[in-house]
């Protein structure tokens, strides 16, 4: 069976029907359907006016405008808000009421596209394998990134979050139109990785998506990750304004000037250093979501009541921090270079700025405890990786899971750890699953490009597709049309259960209390340390253009360079065309399948590190499980990122006069705001009033936006406000 042309709100669209084998199965593929009008710089997306005739949806459209890996030119286009759909078809009747899975790509909110890197005409985010193996509809789409997607003045002049609103427009388009493609508009699952995983998380928390999302999967990124929320957007807006010659004294004039500046100039005005960094790489990621008082009405830690009815899977890779650690400390991947105590202490101190000397020392002591018994370079390098994995991914994900569980009504919660080792031949043998290593398996690359993979890789891919698509169908990864290798138990605050995903899975794959000692350290011990408010706690950023080095790889393999293997410290420069040959991915997640390691398995899967493979010691107390992390604004552990040393600004609530009007925007219904019950909902950050966070006010032109403290504008905001 095949769909032929489909009538959407924009008009008729015609895709391609691709036959699969001799049994009559096929997949209908639609590429490049507009879900919003061509964008205007630094403006919210608008509905597409539609078209006449039949749109031939047969080719991917250009990605949204972004810098090339060398950061000296741009590619992509301002007209970029398009989506792609894969619909599996049986032999006889066209599909009806299929679950829908919407992918949100990663790339540090700075780069990426809905189709991903291309290798042998197979795109990383090609939905065919998931769709046909799992019998689900797969949707991918583009959203604005970098300054064009996330530049904000921290007030109503430029509220920011344009890229998040693009994502919402795509989700809402799917809700309204997917029935015509054979999808069930009441069974939409979001899934995404890295910044895409965080975006999934943020979309579930935004009141604008009330009633749109049934389930969600966050891979290596949640709303609470320390690189997700920009607490000092004006600092970064001014940096760009200065570069393009806009006035910075008055926010309104600056905003008007930025809106009429050549979008390419805006894009190139922001450069991320990759080599010779003075501070950890994540300090330099400036254009990310903000708490705008509308789309994201309050600190994400206080919005989990909005996701109370959404089934949720979240997890990380066991060495998610490896690629970042290897940029921050290049010795990690070099057998002839050593990591010293001094190196690690410096790194730790840069991540713990807001807690001053005590924060650095206690953190250093906790992480180097094993060094006395095992002073080997391998152990020390693993420690650095574990540290960055914990801070950037694992701890925030654990907190997000606990928050979801604590607020959930009917919704289920599941946790996983992906440990199938990286296949990058240039990496040391001890490296586990690096950041973005999971993507290739979720998207079925071992089946789509089999020559680059081994049978064990296909086993992992089959299992992940089965779990992911079963979950999309039923809300339970064990139940659906696909057989799974072992039962995945839900996460609860009592058991902290998680599934370890490896090539050999059985009953022992279900584990408990991942790295509990470190989770408890960050959420209890570290949190209790006094915050240093001294201005010296915030590092000064490099200001020159000398650091115009490649963008750090953060999830979209198509733009991620191979980690350096020589002594130069600089990665090779890949091609820069929009559709040319992709750079070699750092993590085997895409394009060129990496050279298989010699031997049967390559590096063995690394057990959850830091606890010597032994089950972590449960915390003291009655429950035998880690406590649910503090939920008030003052108690968001490694979560709230990139603020000044002081507390984050709070959206105006209650004291600013009359309460805002409930939303009239795209939400579809009044937003859910956290309830006041501290047992299940985080304490709202509203000072003394005790009132819940402000709901969105509909039109972001007039949205309340939290004030930003600009008194330290000359300084670089710390990326983590631990």
């Amino acid at each position: 069976a095949k769909l032929g042309a489909v009538y959407t709100e924009g008009g008729f669209v015609e895709g391609v029907n691709k036959k699969l084998g001799l049994l009559g199965d096929s997949v209908d593929i639609f590429k490049g359907i507009p879900f919003a009008a061509p964008t205007k710089a630094l403006e919210n997306p608008q509905p597409h006016p539609g078209w006449q005739g039949t749109l031939k949806a047969k080719n991917f459209k250009k990605r949204c405008l972004q810098a090339t890996i060398t950061q000296d030119s741009t590619y992509g286009d301002e007209d970029c808000l398009y989506l792609n759909i894969w619909v599996p078809q049986g032999r006889k009747q066209v599909s009806r009421d299929l679950p829908v899975m919407i992918w949100i790509y990663g790339g540090a909110f700075l780069m990426g596209s809905g189709h991903g890197a291309n290798f042998l005409n197979n795109y990383l985010y090609d939905g065919e394998e998931i769709a046909t193996r799992g019998n689900v509809i797969v949707v991918t789409f583009n959203y604005r990134v970098g300054p064009l997607g996330f530049l904000s003045t921290g007030d109503a002049n430029l509220p920011g979050n344009y890229g998040l609103r693009d994502q919402h427009m795509a989700i809402a388009w799917v809700k309204r139109n997917i029935a015509a493609f054979g999808g069930d508009p009441n069974n939409i699952t979001l899934f995404g990785e890295s910044a895409g995983g965080a975006s999934v998380s943020l979309q579930t928390l935004s009141p604008y998506n009330k009633g749109l999302i049934r389930r969600a999967i966050s891979q290596s990124g949640v709303a609470l990750s320390p690189w997700v929320i920009q607490k000092n957007p004006l600092f970064w807006a001014k940096k760009v304004a200065e570069k393009v010659g806009c006035p910075v004294g008055d926010a309104a004039r600056m905003a008007q000037c930025l809106k009429v500046t050549d979008p390419r100039a805006l894009t190139l005005a922001y450069k991320v250093p990759l080599a010779g960094l003075e501070y950890p790489m994540l300090h330099y990621v400036g254009f990310v979501p903000v708490i705008d008082g509308d789309f994201i009405p309050a600190d994400p830690i206080n919005l989990y009541a909005n996701a109370a009815d959404i089934d949720y899977i979240a997890g990380t890779n066991n060495m998610d921090g490896h690629i970042f650690a290897s940029i921050d400390m290049p010795a990690i991947n070099k057998g002839n270079k050593k990591v010293t105590e001094e190196d690690f202490y410096k790194l730790v101190s840069e991540f713990t700025i807001t807690k001053g000397l005590r924060g650095a020392k206690t953190t250093f002591d906790v992480y180097t405890e094993s060094w006395a018994q095992d002073p080997s370079q391998e152990n020390k390098k693993k420690t650095v990786v574990d540290f960055e994995t914990d801070v950037l991914f694992l701890v925030p994900t654990e907190i997000a899971l606990a928050q979801h569980r604590a607020n959930a009504k009917s919704a289920k919660t599941y946790a996983y750890l992906f440990s199938h080792p990286s296949r990058m031949p240039v990496y040391p043998k001890w490296v586990g699953a690096d950041h973005a290593d999971d993507i290739q398996y979720v998207f079925g690359k071992p089946f789509a490009t089999p020559t680059g993979y081994r049978p064990q890789d296909r086993t992992v891919s089959k299992a992940m597709i089965a779990y992911w698509t079963n979950f999309a169908k039923t809300g339970d990864p064990n139940m659906g049309d696909s057989a799974v290798p072992t039962h995945w138990e839900p996460y609860t605050t009592e058991n902290s259960g998680y599934l370890e995903i490896t090539k050999k899975m059985g009953s022992s794959s279900m584990k408990r209390s991942l790295r509990t000692n470190f989770l408890r350290y960050w959420t209890l011990t570290y949190l209790a340390l006094p915050t240093v408010t001294d201005q010296e706690a915030t590092p000064v950023p490099p200001t020159g253009d000398s650091e115009a080095t490649p963008v750090p790889p953060t999830g979209d393999s198509e733009t991620a360079p191979v980690p350096p293997t020589g002594d130069s410290g600089a990665p090779p420069v890949p091609p820069t065309g929009d559709s040319g040959a992709p750079p070699v991915p750092p993590t085997g997640d895409s394009g060129a399948p990496p050279v298989p390691p010699t031997g049967d398995s390559g590096a063995p899967p690394v057990p959850p590190t830091g606890d010597s493979g032994a089950p972590p010691v449960p915390p003291t107390g009655d429950s035998g499980a880690p406590p649910v992390p503090p939920t008030g604004d003052s108690g968001a552990p490694p979560v709230p990122p990139t603020g000044d040393a002081g507390p984050p600004p709070v959206p105006p609530t209650g004291d600013s006069g009359a309460p805002p009007v409930p939303p009239t925007g795209d939400s579809g219904a009044p937003p859910v705001t956290p309830t006041g019950d501290s047992e299940t909902a985080p304490v709202p950050p509203t000072g003394d009033s005790g009132a819940p966070p402000v709901p969105p006010t509909g039109d972001s032109e007039a949205a309340p936006v939290p004030p930003t403290d600009d008194s330290k504008e000359a300084q670089m905001p710390a990326v983590i406000r631990f």
Partner: antibody, heavy 119, light 105 residues
Amino acid sequence: QVQLVQSGAEVKKPGASVKVSCKASGYTFTSYNMHWVRQAPGQGLEWMGVINPGDGYTSYTQKFKGRVTMTRDTSTSTVYMELSSLRSEDTAVYYCARDYYGSSPLGYWGQGTLVTVSS
Amino acid sequence: DIQMTQSPSSLSASVGDRVTITCRASQSISYLNWYQQKPGKAPKLLIYAASKLPSGVPSRFSGSGSGTDFTLTISSLQPEDFATYYCQQRSSSPTFGQGTKLEIK
């Protein structure tokens, strides 16, 4: 100027079929989608489906799938709507309407055709 | 399908009055159109894309709203404005509101 002229009133028995025509003039016939909307006596408007006169692609609302067929004749710039297995509740005025621009507003309407289904 | 609910179902007003009709969608929609229909006549497009006026429509008609809540306003009623008004949403299966009958008081 844009004109949509529909065929005359029809009286049909239950179980029969009716075919209503809509002749377009004043614009390029194949460039705009044509919709069919019906209105039962004293009731509101109900969208039935749409045809692209350029390639003949159609889309029908779930309620009418299997009973309605929309076709076009480019040589005469005419679209047709055939409704089968008529029942008394199909008694209504049937309108053809052309897109105004883009894909949404129905900017130009025919005068309507009354179809009465009665035994 | 997306349900469209208009309010009020009917209303009486006098020439010169300012009149407001609302339309609420059961979920967020991208575009909303308004039509005017007089007895025995075909509907006429009044406003499209929530707030845009087709050529020939008097400026006393205006529309606003986004997401789920929309409004049609007639700033100063004229005798020829007494009619039934329908809202319509655009999706893969367009639907109309049940109509609002505007009568002379």
